[in-house]
């Protein structure tokens, strides 16, 4: 396909652009360029005739265009007015036209910008700073960079004046950074030199690291203090209120139980005169303590909640271990360990995640185990199941239905008959039932913790007479030699015998016929067209029997190899050729004919009047069954002799 590529697409004023032609057809008469998206004569820039290799200017020619033999167009010394679409019109030697449109945009070059500021040393949480990008330039986009990153989203940052001005309200220490502005258009981008904003702040409450407060006897204690501050803070350490040293780090080698106590770090900012302190309590153990498990959620909800189990206490240089169901942790995408193995997170808990869970702390000689923790996962209720599964009962028997739904806490059950509440029990018992007890029996399971309810409805029919059964099928249109069909005799009834008939006869013995489900289900494997029969099921008990209406199996088959009639293959000139094609198929196939490979008509009968030797050749009948997706064909050779030349030939139809 003929296409135009503008190189470049965005062009700087004064530069040049090449409208590059791709897929130029061969055998050309000529081509012509136009300003705009149409081939209008008054917008012609330049035309080129291949035969004469002559380029001739048009009404829109400016003197800055050069056309090349490959049809590409160079436009030099670009001006703003050159922006827009350009159309190439190609006339091929066969005088067929092709057109393609390209476009480019023109922009000016930009000068290097600079930043002006209204405050060079603002105070945190007090001052505002306004930066302005100079100079003001038309058709330019203004961008701002903080530490060479684009602007963060913040309600304290406001762009105004077409993004030329950046205002920082209530400056914070995080605003201490290198600020640059940039002017951009599609052909140039210029960045200013950086302006450093120096915000005075602090000190904040110091942080003592590492965070762990439990140590073993004999270890080294190395505490570091840091407080955010500008200018940087000066630090002092106190142990149990007694001054120790004026350093940022406190180091005590080979600690003992006597080094347990409160450790205070004080940070001081000489510019603001402010002091802040932080205290941590350090415990030194002679031996590791027995671990215990804490949980962030004691009653998680299935498929909703995550649970984080943490092994306490936090001890430096310690290995943490976990067990679930007295086994080491299984590999699962729902189980995640923290970097130090101290926290085990179960994502999207399930009812199978109850545990027990144990954690351990390993020392040189042994592993100390925590007590086991069991999760109480709330779930359900699932859809309740009503048993037994019978739907037909005889009068006089006892009806005993039981309902169960998986649930934690255990579900509360209610029974309804025909929508009317009966009782709040798991089991429903009705003695000596009559026809009046027929109806819709609903079991409702409710989980009081989650507030969720689920119901199951069962139709109960009480009748001395068995109902007329019906046949349900899992496949109404099976394909021969491919599909299986399962017939099921409905309904399921108590103390009932199920029987089957095919075409009024009892079931034939066949490895393709299988009875299951107490003879309620009849399965035909690998159906054939011969299985397209009337199937009847029957139910009987000691007092009654009944048969279903017949269900006829509609087996899709074929098309078989077609037969062309009549069988004659030799004809006399002048006879009528009347060929009929037939193929066994369900549903009936679609027919089509080809003579010497050339498609003819989509009919079952092919009729040609007064044939001649020109009608010699191969006659193919094609059959296709859209339902089975299968096709078939047959080919017949027909010879037509001139009249009287070959005695004994058929005279045709």
């Amino acid at each position: 396909k003929l296409t135009i590529e503008s190189t470049p697409f965005n062009v700087a004023e004064g530069k040049e652009v090449l409208l590059l032609v791709h897929n130029l057809p061969q055998h050309l008469f000529g081509y012509s360029w136009y300003k705009g998206e149409r081939v209008d004569g008054n917008r012609q820039i330049i035309g080129y005739v291949i035969g004469t290799q002559q380029a001739t200017p048009g009404p829109a020619y400016s003197g800055r265009e050069i056309i090349y033999p490959n049809a590409s167009l160079l436009i030099q010394n670009i001006i703003q007015n050159d922006t827009g679409f350009y159309t190439l019109h190609v006339i091929k030697s066969d005088l067929v036209n092709e057109e393609a449109t390209g476009q480019f945009r023109v922009y000016p070059e930009l000068p290097k910008p600079s930043i002006s500021s209204n405050n060079s040393k603002p105070v945190e949480d007090k001052d505002a700073v306004a930066f302005t990008c100079e100079p003001e330039t038309q058709d330019a986009t203004y961008l701002w960079w903080v530490n060479n990153q684009s602007l963060p989203v913040s309600p304290r940052l406001q762009l105004s004046n077409g993004n030329r001005t950046l205002t920082l309200f209530n400056v914070t220490r995080n605003d201490t950074a290198s600020y640059k502005c940039e002017t951009q258009n599609p052909v140039s981008a210029r960045r200013s030199d950086s302006v450093i904003l120096n915000v005075l702040y602090g000190p904040d409450a110091p942080t003592i690291s590492p965070l762990n407060t439990s140590y073993r006897s004999g270890e080294n204690l190395n505490l570091s203090c840091h407080a955010a501050s500008n200018p940087p803070a000066q630090y002092s350490w106190f142990v149990n209120g007694t001054f120790q040293q004026s350093t940022q780090e406190l180091f005590i080698p080979n600690i003992t139980v006597n080094n347990s106590g409160s450790y205070t770090c004080q940070a001081h900012n000489s510019d603001t005169g402010l002091n802040r302190t932080t205290v941590t309590t350090i415990t030194v153990y002679a031996e590791p303590p027995k671990p215990f498990i804490t949980s962030n959620n004691s009653n998680p909800v299935e498929d909703e909640d995550a649970v984080a189990l943490t092994c306490e206490p936090e001890i430096q240089n310690t290995t943490y271990l976990w067990w679930v169901n007295n086994q080491s942790l299984p590999v699962s995408p729902r189980l995640q360990l923290s970097n130090d193995n101290r926290t085990l997170t179960l994502l999207s808990v399930t009812r199978n995640d109850v545990g027990p869970y144990e954690c351990g702390i390993q020392n040189e000689l042994s592993v100390d185990h925590s007590d086991p923790v069991i999760l109480n996962v709330l779930y359900g209720p699932d859809d309740p199941t009503i048993s037994p599964s019978y739907t037909y009962y005889r009068p006089g028997v006892n009806l005993s239905l039981s309902c169960h739904a998986a649930s934690n806490p255990p579900a509360q059950y209610s029974w309804l008959i025909d929508g009317n509440i009966q009782q709040h029990t798991q089991e429903l018992f009705i003695s000596n039932i009559t026809e009046k007890n027929s109806g819709l029996y609903t079991c409702q399971a409710n989980n009081s913790a989650s507030g969720h309810s689920r119901t199951t409805v069962k139709t109960i029919t009480v009748s001395a007479e068995l109902p007329k059964p019906s046949i349900s099928s899992n496949n109404s249109k099976p394909v021969e030699d491919k599909d299986a069909v399962a017939f099921t005799c409905e309904p399921e009834a108590q103390n009932t015998t199920y029987l089957w008939w095919v075409n009024g006869q009892s079931l034939p013995v066949s490895p393709r016929l299988q009875l299951s489900n107490g003879n309620r289900t009849l399965t035909l494997f690998n159906v054939t067209r011969n299985d397209a029969r009337a199937y009847v099921c029957g139910i009987q008990n000691s007092v009654s029997a009944n048969r279903s209406d017949p269900v006829t199996l509609d087996v899709l088959y074929g098309p078989d190899t077609p037969i062309i009639s009549p069988p004659d293959s030799s004809y006399l000139s002048g006879a009528n050729l009347n060929l009929s094609c037939h193929s066994a198929s369900n549903p009936s196939p679609q027919y089509s004919w080809r003579i010497n490979g050339i498609p003819q008509q989509h009919t079952q009968v092919l009729f040609i009047a007064k044939i001649t030797p020109n009608n010699n050749g191969t006659y193919a009948c094609f059959v296709s069954n859209l339902a089975t997706g299968r096709n078939n064909s047959i080919v017949k050779s027909i010879t037509v002799s001139a009249s009287g030349t070959s005695p004994g030939l058929s005279a045709g139809a």
């Epitope: 004569g41 035309g47 005739v49 048009g58 036209n97 057109e99 393609a100």
Partner: antibody, heavy 116, light 111 residues
């Protein structure tokens, strides 16, 4: 091959609006202008305007500005012309056409009859 | 707008003879490389059919008895020899600018 299939004939009341469709097949619909041409019974051809479906760019004959509105749906390869405030003067056969300039492919035409 | 004037409005030509249809533009529609004039044929109940593009280029599939000539403002469509099937209306159209106007049409009958 290139084909333009236009919508069927329309009988409209004066003052009403009608929207004629032109479904294109056999080429890249978005890349070529669709022209609209009017022919009143027993009269010649009158150029209404054109649309480039890919960009939605339109050009109208001044005589038809406010009368005709062109739209294009690239997803269904269909161009539309809406004629508003119909009068008896708008009774005509309307054609769509396309191809590289000039226009070698035409729809079969849509007859619009305006009658009280 | 460019006005295209066709003449004659109708003509009758004997089978096998030459038919000549003229189209005059109110301003030039030619550059030094191209002429932006085209000819269409329209039969009753049918859309127009492109015959000649750019004044003299025969559209693919159009019989060679059709020919076009002219530049600037004066253009001619010739049909020789005319055949029965050439009975139709013939229109010229320019593509010099927007709007692209058509000529008033010429009705050709075969005697």
């Amino acid at each position: 091959q290139v084909q333009l299939q236009q919508s069927g004939a329309e009988l409209m009341k004066p003052g009403a609006s009608v929207k004629i469709s032109c479904k294109a097949t056999g080429y890249t619909f978005s890349d070529y202008w669709i022209e609209w041409v009017k022919q009143r019974p027993g009269h010649g051809l009158e150029w209404i305007g054109e649309i480039l479906p890919g960009s939605g760019r339109t050009d109208y004959n001044e005589r038809f500005k406010g009368k005709a509105t062109f739209t294009g749906d690239v997803s269904s390869n269909t161009a539309y012309m809406k004629l508003s405030s119909l009068t008896s003067e708008d009774s005509a056969v309307y054609y769509c056409a396309t191809g590289t300039t000039p226009f070698g492919y035409w729809g079969q035409g849509t007859l619009v009859t305006v009658s009280a | 707008d460019i006005v295209l004037t066709q003449s004659p409005a109708s003509l009758a030509v004997s089978l096998g003879q030459r038919a000549t249809i003229s189209c005059r533009a109110s301003q030039s529609v030619s550059t030094s490389s191209y002429t932006y004039m085209h000819w269409y044929q329209q039969k009753p109940g049918q859309p127009p059919k492109l015959l000649i593009k750019y004044a003299s280029n025969l559209e693919s599939g159009v019989p060679a008895r059709f020919s076009g000539s002219g530049s600037g403002t004066d253009f001619t469509l010739n049909i020789h020899p005319v055949e029965e099937e050439d009975t139709a209306y013939y229109y010229c159209q320019h593509s010099w600018e927007i709007p692209r106007t058509f000529g008033g049409g010429t009705k050709l009958e075969i005697k």
